[in-house]
């Protein structure tokens, strides 16, 4: 089931998924001056079986001027700054991304794709937060958020991260971080059973990730 809302916004921070659960969908978005080909897919879908997951469908962009003929154009640096929404993320491919059962890696970029990606997450997805360049992380607890199903409704847990305006970037996720105090987690998690399979796996995997998987263009 798709998560109703997007991961929480943390001031001066961006989020990133290390891997995408099966069922996740990614919009086929094109950069300015290009459009999705008429017969092309609207979304890519993370799909698979117990042993292998991959992205179904391919995104294809064509020049808005010349319809249905794909044009190979390398984006100029000034074209990289277009609209931003909180759910869009950089299409950067983590080089050391581990394989998780039932998860897809970051899809490779397609020709003339938009500068940021729009994902539709499913229940059980975990995302990780990092402060943008020029801000330092103060952890009260885990700098991650999980989409959970509670009483038939989905919600994202609140990441315990504050980004302060000190001129140094945070080292994530290798920083020391204290355990979150009970009052740090406002949501009640005792009244309903929530399955947390593979959350721990993802957390362990996150600890091995390099900070390079995040971009710092979100200011």
């Amino acid at each position: 089931e798709l998560c109703d809302d997007d991961p929480p916004e943390i001031p001066h921070a961006t989020f990133k998924a290390m891997a995408y659960k099966e069922g996740t969908m990614l919009n086929c978005e094109c950069k300015r001056g290009f459009r999705r080909i008429k017969s092309g897919s609207l979304y890519m879908l993370c799909t698979g079986n117990s042993s292998h997951s991959s992205w179904d469908n391919q995104c294809q962009c064509t020049s808005s001027a010349t319809r249905n003929t794909t044009k190979q154009v390398t984006p100029q640096p000034e074209e990289q700054k277009e609209r931003k929404t909180t759910e869009m993320q950089s299409p950067m491919q983590p080089v050391d991304q581990a394989s998780l059962p039932g998860h897809c890696r970051e899809p490779p970029p397609w020709e003339n794709e938009a500068t940021e990606r729009i994902y539709h997450f499913v229940v059980g997805q975990m995302v990780y937060y990092q402060c943008v360049q020029g801000y330092r992380a103060l952890h009260r607890g885990p700098a991650e958020s999980v989409c959970k199903m509670t009483h038939g409704k989905t919600r994202w847990t609140q990441p315990q991260l504050i980004c302060t305006g000190e001129m140094e970037t945070s080292q994530f996720p290798g920083e020391e971080k204290p355990q979150a105090s009970p009052e740090g987690r406002p949501e009640s998690e005792t009244s309903c059973l929530v399955t947390t399979t593979d959350f721990q796996i993802q957390t362990e995997m996150a600890a091995t990730m390099e900070t390079s998987i995040f971009t710092t263009e979100y200011q």
């Epitope: 919009n27 978005e29 609209r83 929404t85 909180t86 759910e87 539709h120």
Partner: nanobody, 126 residues
């Protein structure tokens, strides 16, 4: 020229229902994602619901899920928002929006929508 025209707003008591309509001209809804947003006085515009023309993805804000239903009549080039169990906090101007790509939902998701209606007022009294 593209036009989206909302209708169906009005004053209703808490617990009541309304059905909003969005009539499109200048574009065909059968190749556009349609969405509803709302803006309460003094607040930012808020995503309510969206549905692509292929019915692959339908998204709702958690605050309306289970109470509101987005639907569309592609042949009639019209979109709908059925609003049940209305609450005073649903009071706002409701806007219809459309875009060529897939569904975009979320806190600041308005930017990617290309076309907007003028809005229709919904007031829920307690």
């Amino acid at each position: 020229q593209v036009q989206l025209v909302e209708s169906g707003g009005g004053l209703v008591q808490a617990g009541g229902s309304l059905r909003l309509s969005c009539a499109a001209s200048g574009i065909t809804f059968n190749d556009h994602t349609m969405a509803w947003f709302r803006q309460a006085p003094g607040k930012e515009r808020e995503f309510v619901a969206a549905r692509d023309w292929s019915d692959i993805i339908t998204r709702y804000a958690s605050s309306v899920k289970g109470r509101f239903t987005i639907s569309r009549d592609n042949a009639g080039n019209t979109g709908f928002l059925q609003m049940n169990s209305l609450r005073p906090e649903d009071t706002a101007v409701y806007y219809c929006a459309a875009r060529e790509g897939g569904v975009v939902a979320g806190v600041r998701s308005g930017a990617p929508y290309d076309y907007w209606g003028q809005g229709t007022q919904v007031t829920v009294s307690s």
